[in-house]
């Protein structure tokens, strides 16, 4: 049976916590990703940004989980208008920002 949206979001949050907690060396070798607008369509936008990071096992599970939240197919090189124009940040900072935002969505009951 499908996982309830609240459970799926909780699991995504916990996965992001694990990533930030287990950071020994720079996450994904310090790779940079496009910063995104966190106000709407956050799951697809986050996936569109992170999918361009390859060969980083630490975020592969996060990429798969975000894919489950995004209703359309996302491929590398694809960007929506939710990208913050010409602003790149390290994956580690991206994950931290995304984590805080998702915790707020969970509090507000926005599970989808």
């Amino acid at each position: 049976s499908p996982v309830p949206p609240s459970t799926a979001l909780k699991e995504l949050i916990e996965e992001l916590v694990n990533i930030t907690q287990n950071q020994k060396a720079p996450l994904c070798n310090g790779s940079m990703v496009w910063s995104i607008n966190l106000t709407a369509g956050v799951y697809c936008a986050a996936l569109e940004s992170l999918i361009n990071v390859s060969g980083c096992s630490a975020i592969e599970k996060t990429q798969r989980m975000l894919n489950g939240f995004c209703p359309h197919k996302v491929s590398a090189g694809q960007f929506s208008s939710l990208r913050v124009r010409d602003t790149k940040i390290e994956v580690a900072q991206f994950v931290k920002d995304l984590l805080v935002h998702l915790k707020k969505l969970f509090r507000e009951g926005q599970f989808n």
Partner: antibody, heavy 122, light 108 residues
Amino acid sequence: QMQLVESGGGVVQPGRSLTLSCAASGFEFRTYGMHWVRQAPGKGLEWVGVIWDDGSNTHYADSVKGRFTITRDNSKNTLNLQMNSLRVEDTAVYYCARAPQWYLTAEAFDLWGQGTMVTVSS
Amino acid sequence: SYILTQPPSVSVAPGETATITCGGNLIGAKLVHWYQQKPGQAPVLVIYDDSDRPSRIPERFSGSNIGNTATLTIEDVEAGDEADYYCQVWDYSANHMVFGGGTKLTVL
């Protein structure tokens, strides 16, 4: 200005009852979840319970569940804490505090009252 | 129920940086709030949602929350910062608000 004012504290014998009130002013009371927090002399803060903005839900700390009841009257901007079967360990300063109401009430308390002292003693 | 662990006391000299920790199982998955309480006064919110600061709180106060530890940092500590500090989270599983035991900050 925004304000919460508690009243109703005093000395009461074990096993008796007491009702505390919290009067809100300067903000839209009905849009906030309201909490009670207590602090025993020389001790830390202990959450007592919460009532949702519309009064539809209440949650209580295990230590007071079944003995304390939180109610609110949004037409009068008042919050109440009915305390029954009081115990010596209920002795504390009782604060009311507001928190913006979210689906799961995990919000910070951005406004507190000055507190009212409750002493349970024989 | 969810337990938050704080050191009972932290001491720091004026002008130095104070670090107060709040430990909890996967606390990084929760939004953490911090309060300052001076003797005989009601608590005051100093940090909310892990790292946000109310407008009236000086920039010297900051917060972080990673893994199993949330941290309140006070830079350039002043005598007026001497107080008890409490962390707080909402325990979703129990529908309870939880406070840490509090940390007494002493400015030497």
